[in-house]
């Protein structure tokens, strides 16, 4: 009679994490009598995975009924596979012996690889806001995938970016891997509505990549442009001075009016108008009682935007150009009329 052979037909199998793995093994003879054992690995360090005769192996079930007299199928099913289960599994036939069974023949082994999906990519931007024309860095991280091969791409508003560096860790063997990528993005004034997208493609995702996004609205600061203008008002001795604050982002803005360098009023922006590009406009105005002034007046609109150093724009009000009211020298009254800021775009 021909000598028993242990046949493991699958050289390798690949299983998704969480699923069951079936490891096939058949023998070609019922002789010699003795049990089958399954090991992960070979040599003195191999790990026992299943023993037909004894032991408790809660995740392992046999495919066939091993109690049947002429059973020759010793395939096993391992449930709830994790990346830690990867390795080469050997089906080993033992010959009955006393006191111990004696190893008789081993199958050629089945390499089990475990596919694990990457976690949803998390994109994070810089801690502080930056202004247009500056380059900022975004990071993207995804974890827990196997095998190691993975593809990562960056996009800004659908356009692929090329300035990025990607690392997959660890460099050596591991049950699962992580990817970390840093992309550099140049900001423009139009980026308030822009998005940066990190896209991860992996064999486990069946062609449907995972995406992580970051809104540039969280990153960008568009400083305002200021314009101070004056228009005459009906009353001869009053002038309307407006400060147009245009194209700024984010909304946080405080405006201070100064009269010849002295603070006259401070207000916080409200009732903003939003532009198509996501930036905001705001206007503040003052009624200036010209008759209250003997000399020219320097009016300054000072804006502190998003906690940044203040920017200002000044306007010289020529007092000589306006006729003065009688008695203005003795009882000038308030130089600046108490005017609420006007909403509206400039």
């Amino acid at each position: 009679e021909e000598e028993l052979q242990v046949i493991q037909p699958d050289k390798s199998i690949s299983v998704a994490a969480g699923e069951s793995a079936t490891l096939h093994c058949t023998v070609t003879s019922l002789i010699p009598v003795g049990p089958i054992q399954w090991f992960r690995g070979a040599g003195p360090g191999r790990e026992l995975i299943y023993n037909q005769k004894e032991g408790h192996f809660p995740r392992v079930t046999t495919v066939s009924d091993l109690t049947k007299r002429n059973n020759m199928d010793f395939s096993i099913r391992i449930s709830n596979i994790t990346p830690a289960d990867a390795g080469t599994y050997y089906c080993v036939k033992f010959r009955k012996g006393s006191p111990d069974h004696v190893e008789f023949k081993s199958g050629a082994g089945t390499e089990l690889s475990v596919r694990a999906k990457p976690s949803a990519p998390v994109v994070s931007g810089p801690a502080a806001r930056a202004t247009p024309q500056h380059t900022v860095s975004f990071t993207c991280e995804s974890h827990g995938f196997s095998p190691r091969d993975i593809t990562l791409k960056w996009f800004k508003n659908g356009n692929e970016l090329s300035d990025f560096q990607t690392n997959v860790d660890p460099a050596g063997d591991s049950v699962s891997y992580s990817i970390h990528s840093t992309a550099k993005v140049v900001l423009t004034r139009e980026d308030v509505h822009s998005q940066v997208i990190c896209e991860v493609a992996h064999v486990t995702l069946q062609g449907d990549p995972l995406r992580g996004t970051a809104n540039l609205s969280e990153t960008i600061r568009v400083p305002p442009t200021l314009e101070v203008t004056q228009q005459p008002v009906r009353a001869e001795n009053q002038v309307n001075v407006t400060c147009q604050v245009r194209k700024f982002y984010p909304q946080r803005l405080q405006l201070t009016w100064l009269e010849n360098g002295n603070v006259s009023r401070t207000e916080t922006a409200s009732t903003l108008t939003e532009n198509k590009d996501g930036t905001y406009n705001w206007m503040s105005w003052l009624l200036v009682n010209v008759s209250a002034h003997r000399d020219d007046v320097k009016l300054t609109c000072q804006v502190e935007h998003d906690g940044q150093p203040a920017v200002s724009k000044s306007h010289d009000l020529k007092v000589s150009a306006h006729p003065k009211e009688q008695g203005s020298n003795t009882a000038p009254g308030p130089a600046l009329a108490s005017a609420a800021p006007l909403g509206g775009s400039g």
């Epitope: 690995g41 040599g43 003195p44 360090g45 063997d173």
Partner: antibody
Framework: QVQLQESGPGLVRPSETLSLTCTVS????????WSWIRQPPGKGLEWIGF???????FYNPSLKSRVTISLDMSINQFSLKMTSVTAADTAVYYC????????????????WGQGTTVTVSS | DIVMTQSPLSLPVTPGEPASISCKSS???????????LDWYLQRPGQSPQLLIY???NRASGVPDRFSGSGSGTDFTLKISRVEAEDVGVFYC?????????FGGGTKVEIK
């Protein structure tokens, strides 16, 4: 192909600890045993011990009390630490890969580092 | 521990001629699965050892077919069918059946 590179100090003082690292490049740690073997000047080869990729270690009983082999798969390195060294530990130390295809035995030490000379002297 | 004994200690050879080295183990290296766990290595002068034969008779990848291994149980032989100048060095046998792995004392092959 797979290459092994030993690194560590060439001179160790008596009673101190010898520490060597072997870096594996061009291949996987998985499914192999990773061995340390030494050769005193003008003498034969002596097996120190090895570690399997699953972390199981095996040591030469004559050195077991002084030897620790560890493995860091994430950086493809394994290490040897030998405490309380004496002049008798002066040798060329080799790191090597051992194959295991079936059964309880081993199927050849098929890749060797170039060896690093360690001298124990005060 | 399994003790490995090699002979001869030194082997002067003539290029083109055959050569033979013996290795004996203190216990059988033939495992119940039918494999004999014995390796042969060549250490050329100033180099690391190189695997020639594993499991008693299997030639390692890239090893010339002039090298062959035979034997089972406790007696093993390495044969070189036609010695070449590059074969000089020390040949070692090693048992790979159980730990501690043990080497023979080595056979120094040199050109006559």
């Amino acid at each position: 192909q797979v290459q092994l590179q030993e690194s560590g100090p060439g001179l160790v003082r008596p009673s101190e600890t010898l520490s060597l690292t072997c870096t594996v490049s061009g291949g996987s740690i998985r499914n192999y045993y990773w061995s340390w073997i030494r050769q005193p000047p003008g003498k034969g080869l002596e097996w120190i011990g090895f570690i399997y990729y699953n972390g199981r270690t095996f040591y030469n009983p004559s050195l077991k009390s002084r030897v620790t082999i560890s493995l860091d798969m994430s950086i493809n390195q394994f290490s040897l630490k030998m405490t309380s060294v004496t002049a008798a530990d002066t040798a060329v130390y080799y790191c090597a890969r051992v194959r295991a295809y079936s059964g309880i035995g081993l199927d050849g030490t098929d890749v060797w580092g170039q060896g690093t000379t360690v001298t124990v002297s005060s | 521990d399994i003790v490995m004994t090699q002979s001869p200690l030194s082997l002067p050879v003539t290029p083109g001629e055959p050569a033979s080295i013996s290795c004996k183990s203190s216990q059988s290296l033939l495992y119940s699965n039918g494999y004999a766990y014995l390796d042969w290595y060549l250490q050329r002068p100033g180099q690391s050892p190189q695997l020639l034969i594993y499991q008693g008779s299997n030639r390692a990848s890239g090893v010339p077919d002039r090298f062959s291994g035979s034997g089972s149980g406790t007696d093993f032989t390495l044969k070189i069918s036609r010695v070449e100048a590059e074969d000089v060095g020390v040949f070692y046998c090693m048992q790979a059946l159980q730990t501690p792995l043990t080497f023979g004392g080595g056979t120094k092959v040199e050109i006559k």
